[in-house]
Interface confidence: medium
């Protein structure tokens, strides 16, 4: 164990240190804004955290740049459909970037899931899951958006969420 | 704060048609549905049915389907309830009330002041 | 059709007293945890204005002398102490699905 050793314990040790940037967020009552905007996450309480990432408005905000696999699963659940319901479901992550004045789509899904409801019983479940690799730059920002929001059940934190970690 | 105005009161005689409005301000119109609620004198509340102003789209209680048409003026945030081949049973105040925007909770959270329709001939 | 039925049909309770007003549903108004039952409260002349929503969250601005409670098919509201103002007919009504129907009410007076 002479010189080598050392410098593989040196390089562990500065490893150890440089914590990647990974965050995991909840759904909460305050997830539904009805403003059309970015589901809103709990960052701190229960399940939920931010290191190495930093959190606004619904947004996950890249401080170092990377290759960043991002995901989030939301719960749909219903009674019947909701009133001026769009035939489908969008589920979808986006970027926003300074060098463009429009979100970017990065993963999306659709669904018509009250097909689900039966004539037996109204009530009906479905979920969305989307996750991939994708590379962020410093100051970019990742939000989670659903229309129909209204569809998203949120109850505990574990139904819907919403993270990031760097690869 | 969230308000909705009703039109004034009608007389109507039987076999004619009434159209109430209800205009909103203070909230996003189009983010809530507005529903329509009667009370004959001295009775309780019946649902008439719900528009929803982001699209138009409607639901009616079975009882006034074909009688009842539910629309929606985004342009003005105004919501209206159009009811045909009236009847004296009809005679009613007739209210609009904001739904909550949590669909499967739909509680009337705001409620307008109540239009009197009068059915007499 | 969803049927609500309330009682008492009237109640008279002295100021101070504590009031409770029942409703029974023809079948379960619940779904994914929550009660879909809701609390109305009117006075002459006046539109229902929204005292309890989803069984027991008080809207804001309601005194908290009100409560609501219950689960499946039978609810509650209470009003832990009358006060003159409570005077008025209380509705309950259900959000579980289409038609949303009305319990008949319940008038509430002073001894």
């Known amino acids: 164990d002479g010189p080598a050793g050392s410098w593989e314990q040196l390089i562990q040790e500065r490893r150890s240190h440089e914590v990647n940037p990974a965050a995991h967020l909840t759904g909460a009552n305050s997830s539904l804004t009805g403003s059309g905007g970015p589901l809103l996450w709990e960052t701190q309480l229960g399940l939920a955290f931010l290191r190495g990432l930093s959190y606004h408005d619904g947004a996950l905000v890249v401080t170092k740049a990377g290759y960043y696999y991002i995901y989030s699963k939301v719960q749909l659940g219903g009674v019947g459909c909701p009133l001026g319901l769009a035939s489908t479901i969008t589920h979808g992550l986006y970027k926003r970037t300074p060098r463009y004045p429009e979100e970017l789509e990065l993963l999306v899904s659709q669904q018509s899931p009250c097909g689900r409801a039966t004539s037996s019983s109204r009530v009906w479940w479905d979920s969305s899951f989307l996750g991939g690799v994708v590379h962020l730059e410093a100051g970019e920002e990742v939000v989670v958006r659903v229309l129909d929001e209204r569809l998203v059940r949120l109850r505990d934190g574990t139904r819907s969420y919403f993270g990031a970690f760097m690869v | 704060q969230v308000q909705l105005v009703q039109s004034g009161a009608e007389v109507k005689k039987p076999g004619a048609s009434v159209k109430v409005s209800c205009k909103a301000s203070g909230y996003t119109f189009t983010s809530y549905n507005v529903h329509w609620v009667r009370q004959a004198p001295g009775q309780g509340l019946e649902w008439i049915g719900a528009?929803?102003?982001?699209?138009?789209?409607?639901s009616y209680n079975q009882k006034f389907k074909g009688r009842a048409t539910l629309t929606a003026d985004k342009s003005t945030s105004t919501a209206y309830m159009e009811l045909s081949s009236l009847r004296s049973e009809d005679t009613a105040v007739y209210y609009c009330?904001?739904?909550?925007?949590?669909?499967?909770?739909?509680?009337?959270?705001?409620w307008g002041q109540g239009t009197l329709v009068t059915v007499s001939s | 059709d969803i049927v609500l039925t309330q009682s008492p049909d009237s109640l008279a309770v002295s100021l101070g007293e504590r009031a409770t007003i029942n409703c029974k549903a023809s079948q379960s108004v619940d779904f994914d945890g929550d009660s879909y039952m809701n609390w109305y409260q009117q006075k002459p002349g006046q539109p229902p204005k929204l005292l309890i929503y989803t069984a027991s969250n008080l809207e804001s601005g309601i005194p908290d002398r009100f409560s609501g409670s219950g689960s499946g098919t039978d609810f509650t509201l209470t009003i832990s102490s009358l006060q003159a103002e409570d005077v008025a007919v209380y509705y309950c009504q259900q959000s579980y699905e289409d038609p949303f129907t009305f319990g008949q009410g319940t008038k509430v007076e002073i001894k």
């Open positions: 009330a904001r739904g909550s925007y949590y669909y499967t909770s739909s509680y009337f959270d705001h």
């Open positions: 528009v929803y102003p982001g699209n138009g789209d409607t």
